[in-house]
């Protein structure tokens, strides 16, 4: 669809005569009839296949024709057509004399024709005007013409329909050749597809308008590139939705079981070394000068009875000091100035000469010790407490403080590993010599029955359109991760499927 435009510019009829040679009285009141038809090698009679148009009286004899496109559109003359422009044409322009106001052919005098021109040729669609001048014996007509496409038509022959739009059916303007040019933020054949936020994950994200990034089920984050872990996952991560892959030091279905108490809680005090020994279980190896389960107790340096031979110990800021009894000297009163003659052995100890009487040694009766048998035997010296238990003197008796997981007088008994109910999901616990074993109920497996092996909700392939299915272990349900272009709990709905063009 387009328009052939004819701009009449100047008509010269200096003598004011008709084609018959007869003069017009008083002058030739001139109007034009235009016939546009398909190309004919010889312009022939017959219909004006591309249209006809007539002008009012434009002037008398010789005159310039005013461009009147703004005021009613009479010049240039418009010859619209509603077919593909063929690129060739025949044009007939007749100048007629109208003595009165009635311009119908039957109302004109028999010889009212002033002049007639017929041209034929090629004409491409374009904005540029072609200027032409036709001269006969008595008249001259100067005019220009062009073919332009109607609104919304484009291309070399005005055959491409393109109507700019910004709605559900497309977001584009039209290029000069009729091809679509998408508005910013849109893409696709008909510019119906929004361009999502830059970096928005191709599979896991989508958008309904430009610069948006909406996440598909199981994904989160600004660019939908972070998976959502299993609901309740405490110390774990995922690489696909609904996973719970435990961080180092954590275990269990929800990664909430602490396997690295040392790192997570730092229970050992005063620079002690911590060793993990099971779930929520640890051992502290104290530095010298400290004691207690968590090495939280500071040992007095005198507690180890460093002073020999009945020397008394005094704590000092930077250590301790031994006050030696008469006859002894040295840092720990270890050197004697006595001999057996001085009866140095207490509590019934018997004295033996050494080094030719320069020194002596006491042989102590049971329950006494020390170089002079001056000390009662410490019942804890022999480390009677097993499994790292701490020995405590309690007057005439002694007792063992056991580490977690041990009991008995000497901490020699393992507390049942089953006492903690370590088997998840109703598993039955069996104590073994070095650990425990869980017998799992139907639908569960793993060392602690923590792995759900119940019916796979994805087994029935509930997701449509090649979506990926994930099983939600906590609810025995499935989640569909839709491919691009589909939404819905089962990815069953297409997103904005390009409809057939509505025009």
């Amino acid at each position: 669809s387009g328009v052939f435009q004819l701009q009449l510019q100047e008509f010269i009829n200096e003598r004011g005569v008709l084609a018959s040679g007869r003069p017009c009285e008083p002058g030739c009141r001139t109007f034009f009839r235009v016939c546009l038809k398909h190309f004919q090698a010889v312009v022939s009679p017959g219909p004006c296949t591309f249209g006809t148009v007539s002008t009012p009286v434009l002037g008398t004899n010789s005159f310039a024709v005013r461009d009147d496109s703004s005021g009613g559109g009479r010049n240039p003359l418009q010859l619209p057509f509603n077919f593909t422009w063929p690129g060739t044409f025949s044009l007939i322009i007749e100048a007629w004399h109208a003595p009165g106001d009635d311009l119908r052919p039957e109302a004109l005098p028999p010889d009212a024709l002033i002049s007639k021109i017929a041209i034929q040729g090629s004409l491409a669609v374009g904005q540029n005007w072609l200027l032409d001048e036709q001269t006969s014996t008595l008249t001259r007509l100067r005019y220009s013409y062009r073919v332009i496409c109607s609104d919304n038509y484009y291309g070399d022959n005005c055959s491409r329909l393109c109507k700019k739009r910004n709605d559900h059916f497309g977001h584009y303007v039209c290029q000069p050749d009729g091809n679509l040019s998408c508005l910013p933020g849109w893409t696709g054949e008909y510019c119906q597809q929004p361009i999502c936020l830059s970096g928005c994950h191709e599979q896991n994200g989508y958008c309904s308008k430009p610069a948006e990034c909406l996440c598909r089920p199981g994904w989160q984050g600004r660019l939908c590139n972070e998976c959502i872990p299993h609901n309740g996952c405490r110390h774990g991560t995922c690489s696909t939705p609904w996973q719970c892959t435990c961080d180092e030091g954590w275990g269990g279905l929800f990664c909430d079981q602490d396997l690295n108490y040392c790192t997570h809680h730092s229970p050992c005090k005063n620079g002690a070394t911590c060793s993990n020994s099971g779930q929520r279980s640890y051992t502290c190896t104290c530095r010298p000068g400290y004691t207690g389960v968590d090495c939280e107790l500071e040992l007095s340096e005198c507690d180890s009875n460093p002073c020999r031979n009945g020397g008394s110990c005094k704590d000092q800021e930077d250590g301790y000091h031994c006050l030696c009894p008469p006859g002894y000297y040295g840092l720990h009163c270890e050197h004697s100035t006595l001999s057996c003659a001085d009866s140095p052995c207490f509590n019934g100890g018997s004295c033996r000469e050494r080094n030719q009487g320069a020194n002596y040694a006491c042989e102590c009766p049971p329950n006494f010790t020390g170089s002079n048998c001056e000390k009662k035997v410490d019942r804890c010296t022999s480390n009677p407490c097993a499994n790292g238990g701490q020995c405590l003197n309690r007057g005439p008796s002694r007792m063992c403080r056991c580490r977690p997981g041990f009991t008995g007088t000497y901490c020699e008994l393992h507390v049942s590993d089953c006492a903690r109910n370590p088997c998840a999901h109703g598993g039955t616990c069996h104590d073994l010599e070095n650990g425990l074993m869980c017998t799992c109920p139907a639908g569960f497996s793993g060392r602690r029955c923590e792995v759900r092996t119940s019916i796979d909700a994805c087994a029935s392939s509930p997701c449509f359109n090649r979506a990926t299915c994930y099983t939600d272990l906590s609810t025995d349900t499935f989640v569909c991760n839709c491919p691009y272009g589909f939404v819905g709990s089962r990815c069953e709905f297409p997103v904005g499927l390009p409809p057939s063009f509505p025009w």
């Epitope: 398909h38 017959g46 004006c48 028999p110 010889d111 024709l113």
Partner: antibody
Framework: QVQLVQSGAEVKKPGASVKISCKAS????????IHWVKQAPGQGLEWIGY????????NYNQKFKGRVTFTTDTSTSTAYMELRSLRSDDTAVYYC????????????WGQGTLVTVSS | DIVMTQSPDSLAVSLGERATISCRAS??????????MKWFQQKPGQPPKLLIY???NQGSGVPDRFSGSGSGTDFTLTISSLQAEDVAVYYC?????????FGGGTKVEIK
Amino acid sequence: QVQLVQSGAEVKKPGASVKISCKASGYSFTAYYIHWVKQAPGQGLEWIGYISCYNGATNYNQKFKGRVTFTTDTSTSTAYMELRSLRSDDTAVYYCARDYDYDVGMDYWGQGTLVTVSS
Amino acid sequence: DIVMTQSPDSLAVSLGERATISCRASESVDNYGISFMKWFQQKPGQPPKLLIYAASNQGSGVPDRFSGSGSGTDFTLTISSLQAEDVAVYYCQQSKEVPWTFGGGTKVEIK
């Protein structure tokens, strides 16, 4: 009123020529075309061709080309058809009719001229 | 050349009745949405008279009972209510291509 008046009947010998006239009145002669149509006795219509009365451009039916010539005289608003090398099958009524670029068709016809070719 | 075939060759219709004449072209006579088809009436001893042009447009002074229809290759002339003065030979004619050609004619008579 529009009129096309043709010359009278002609009797010609085979091999001769005939020139028929068609005088127009009541309209702008130069704006139109003149067609010539043959009708043999008891037969249908056969188109011979046309001439533009404005610039003299012609279009002939191939069947008659070389034996027929169309001319006009704009000063007298008259169109002519000359047919040469006459044969007996040229015996017919010959009509002139006017036509226009704005497709009404051959809306006015002359009364016809009978040409008889006989030895 | 485009061959125009009319049918029937002759037609006898009662006064006031409908008469229908067909014309078939050997190829389409349409161009740019216009049918280059005309119908003429010729009474004995008279020149032809234009009835219909462009397949369906009435010529000047033609009674309304004459109508034309069709496009492409098949055309019809209809006289809705035959009158005595309609007795004549009717010709179809194409002007799409040179040489312009006429149909063989259909003779319409009163039954």
